[in-house]
Interface confidence: low
């Protein structure tokens, strides 16, 4: 499974969208967990509503929010007020009893906010949201613009 690397600015929001086969994962709750080390366990951060039909409702744990569009097959996780300590390897999971199937591995990188940096124009932040297979990151600036950028390059 490919690891998608997403970058976000400190103090801002990062939105990750993990896509999945809606039929295959019918009735399953989703979770967002943080992997402890490369081979370590994945520590649950937040999971979708206990009642699958209410999975579209946002569930929050601290600054992390999850919601699942079960018809579209997209679970969305938002990391609010991103901090350096949020950097690390995460997983989107589909839960089936005690088992968890990995939908997407996501490496979150946190960069300092370069809005005041004269060189910031070189940072690749397109003006329109772009989607791609697997995961998508959206970066909303303090200027109330919504922009997005793909895995870093």
């Amino acid at each position: 499974l490919n690891t998608t690397v997403l970058q976000g600015m400190a103090g801002q929001s990062l939105r990750v969208s993990c896509t999945y086969d809606a039929l295959k994962h019918w009735g399953r709750r989703k979770a967002w967990c943080r992997q402890l080390g490369e081979e370590g366990p994945c520590q649950r951060v937040v999971s979708t509503h206990g009642v699958w039909l209410l999975a579209f409702l946002k569930k929050r744990n601290g600054s992390t929010v999850i919601a699942d569009d079960t018809l579209a097959g997209t679970v969305t996780i938002t990391l609010k007020n991103l901090q350096a300590g949020d950097a690390g390897l995460y997983q989107c999971q589909s839960l089936r009893g005690r088992e968890a199937e990995v939908l997407q591995k996501v490496l979150v990188e946190v960069l300092e906010d370069p809005l005041d940096d004269q060189d910031a124009g070189d940072l690749w932040v397109p003006e329109e949201s772009s989607s791609f297979e697997g995961a998508q990151v959206e970066h909303s600036t303090s200027r109330n613009q919504e922009t997005s950028f793909p895995p870093t390059s």
């Epitope: 490919n2 998608t4 690390g88 300092e112 370069p114 070189d122 690749w124 989607s131 297979e133 895995p151």
Partner: antibody, heavy 116, light 107 residues
Framework: QVQLVQSGAEVKKPGASVKVSCKAS????????MHWVRQAPGQGLEWMGI????????TYAQKFQGRVTMTRDTSTSTVYMELSSLRSEDTAVYYC?????????WGQGTTVTVSS | EIVLTQSPATLSLSPGERATLSCRAS??????LAWYQQKPGQAPRLLIY???NRATGIPARFSGSGSGTDFTLTISSLEPEDFAVYYC?????????FGGGTKVEIK
């Protein structure tokens, strides 16, 4: 202006290690990832991996996993790429590259020759 | 990993002619594809990013198109300084990969 200056050419014996440096200037060092790309003589470009200078986290191409180590020194705005267990196929020009609009700034390249 | 296949391997043209270079990805890379130019002894130079956007300072004769798996770099009228090797590169997923290159040589 934004600049990446790499260390000089190296000649190494098979089995040895090489450490190439890339000093950044003209921008906020911790705000941009750094890539390493190599090019063997007469061959194409090959991506080796990436380092986040802010936290030091890395992601390496599977081909180099276990042989490559990328580090950084924020006090000198320098990133390093160390490649161990060198073999003749590692003879190449090694570039550091800073992503902006894709890889928009490159170092001048460091030639590493592996020969017995 | 995503494999990028460039064609042709060599393109022999005269100054003033139109050059069309192709890059095909083994799976969709959306529009996250860049084109580079490299001359002997020099580092690669970014021409096009995100499939169709010209990088700063790149002449209008260079244009890129495509999305998904098929991409094209077009040089509308070759100048003497355009004879070089051209690489495509995807950054949709790690590992980042490059095509094998197309050499544009003087006929």
């Amino acid at each position: 202006q934004v600049q990446l200056v790499q260390s000089g050419a190296e000649v190494k014996k098979p089995g040895a290690s090489v450490k190439v440096s890339c000093k950044a200037s003209g921008y906020t060092f911790t705000s941009y990832y750094m890539h390493w790309v190599r090019q063997a003589p007469g061959q194409g470009l090959e991506w080796m991996g990436i380092i986040n200078p802010s936290g030091g986290s890395t992601t390496y191409a599977q081909k180099f996993q276990g042989r490559v180590t990328m580090t950084r020194d924020t006090s000198t705005s320098t990133v390093y790429m160390e490649l161990s267990s060198l073999r003749s196929e590692d003879t190449a020009v090694y570039y550091c590259a800073r992503p902006g609009k894709s890889m928009d700034v490159w170092g001048q390249g460091t030639t590493v020759t592996v020969s017995s | 990993e995503i494999v990028l296949t460039q064609s042709p391997a060599t393109l022999s043209l005269s100054p003033g002619e139109r050059a069309t270079l192709s890059c095909r990805a083994s799976q969709s890379v959306s529009s996250y594809l860049a084109w580079y130019q490299q001359k002997p002894g020099q580092a690669p130079r970014l021409l096009i990013y995100d499939a169709s956007n010209r990088a700063t300072g790149i002449p209008a004769r260079f244009s890129g198109s495509g999305s998904g798996t098929d991409f094209t770099l077009t040089i509308s009228s070759l100048e003497p300084e355009d004879f070089a090797v051209y690489y495509c590169q995807q950054r949709s997923h790690f590992p980042i990969t490059f095509g094998g290159g197309t050499k544009v040589e003087i006929k």
